[in-house]
């Protein structure tokens, strides 16, 4: 599914993203944008042997299982292929233990490079929320 | 226990196309990403790409990019590679296996033979 | 692409022997190689996975060494069941790739 950008926001809104640790919902939001361009199915191979998934792009070399990346911690304790559901309750739940880790939203290399101290309220202004 | 059935031989004229399936029973489906070999004599094994039925999402082989097609069915657990514009330089073993970095999981293999 | 040569493409082996195959990679691939067996019109069998683990159900005659870009599948003690080829193939990156083969006969 490839999310509308307010109807992303709604949905992350719902499942508690809204100022979850600190971050305000534009961050997020913006965070899916660079990551995943709102695309809950999209998958990135990185040089390392693993693999990025869904949304927000999350690692199967630490959080999830993808059954093929070696050394893998599976920290949300979920196999990968749930990141890519058009529900994005699976993929909300992770990065909540991602963004609970201790680098924030530094974890996502798309929001350090791309919504880190940028006007992030732009992504959610104009949304019925 | 984990098992991958792929289709029967097929022999197929050059220019034509085949769908080759790969049925998977023992495990969930959706979540192991399904990887295509080929395997020709005195060419070795090599690797044609990959699908992630759960999600649709595909990976090729540079050298395969225009040849082969993936698709997934998840309601019947099956995996498809399409061939096309079909010529004797396809004319090989075609595997389905489980990607898991390594291949535990292998269907039995394809034998495609294109001619005239 | 990375590239995986294998020595020698032919052994000739006596039941009882022991023997080493070799697989070279063209760039360092830390220990993401597996090794399998494959018997005519048969599927390739996995032996050995991450260089030296051995796969459920694998005599431990077979081993796995080798890190980085040179590795070494040994089988102590060769049975007449082990002949056949063997194929490495690596997981460090796509696309994934295999080696050309060494062929196990008897002598």
């Known amino acids: 599914k490839v999310f509308g950008r307010c109807e992303l926001a709604a949905a992350m809104k719902r499942h508690g993203l809204d100022n979850y640790r600190g971050y305000s919902l534009g961050n997020w939001v913006c965070a899916a944008k660079f990551e995943s361009n709102f695309n809950t199915q999209a998958t990135n191979r990185n040089t390392d042997g693993s693999t990025d998934y869904g949304i927000l792009q999350i690692n199967s070399r630490w959080w999830c299982n993808d059954g093929r990346t070696p050394g893998s911690r599976n920290l949300c304790n979920i196999p990968c292929s749930a990141l890519l559901s058009s529900d994005i309750t699976a993929s909300v739940n992770c990065a909540k233990k991602i963004v609970s880790d201790g680098n924030g939203m530094n974890a996502w290399v798309a929001w350090r490079n791309r919504c880190k101290g940028t006007d992030v309220q732009a992504w959610i202004r104009g949304c019925r929320l | 226990q984990v098992q991958l059935q792929e289709s029967g031989a097929e022999v197929m004229k050059p220019g034509a196309s085949v769908k080759i399936s790969c049925k998977a029973t023992g495990y969930t489906f959706t979540t192991y990403w399904i990887e295509w070999v080929k395997q020709r004599p005195g060419h070795g094994l090599e690797w044609i790409g990959e699908i992630l039925p759960g999600s649709g999402s595909t990976y090729y082989n540079e050298k395969f990019k225009g040849k082969a097609t993936f698709t997934a069915d998840t309601s019947s657990n099956t995996a498809y590679m399409q061939l096309s514009s079909l010529t004797s330089e396809d004319s090989a073993v075609y595997y389905c296996?489980?990607?898991?970095?390594?291949?535990?999981?292998w269907g039995q293999g394809t034998t495609l033979t294109v001619s005239s | 692409d990375i590239e995986l040569t294998q020595s020698p493409a032919t052994l000739s082996v006596t039941p009882g022997d022991s023997v080493s195959l070799s697989c070279r990679a063209s760039?360092?691939?830390?220990?993401?190689l597996h090794w399998y067996q494959q018997k005519s019109h048969e599927s390739p069998r996995l032996l050995i996975k991450y260089a030296s683990q051995r796969a459920s159900g694998i005599p431990s005659r077979f081993s796995g060494s080798g890190s980085g870009t040179d590795f070494t599948l040994s089988i102590n003690s060769v049975e007449t069941e082990d002949f056949g080829m063997y194929f490495c193939q690596q997981s460090n990156s796509w696309p994934r790739t295999f080696g050309g083969g060494t062929k196990l006969e008897i002598k």
């Open positions: 296996a489980r990607g898991d970095g390594f291949y535990y999981y």
């Open positions: 760039q360092s691939i830390s220990n993401n």
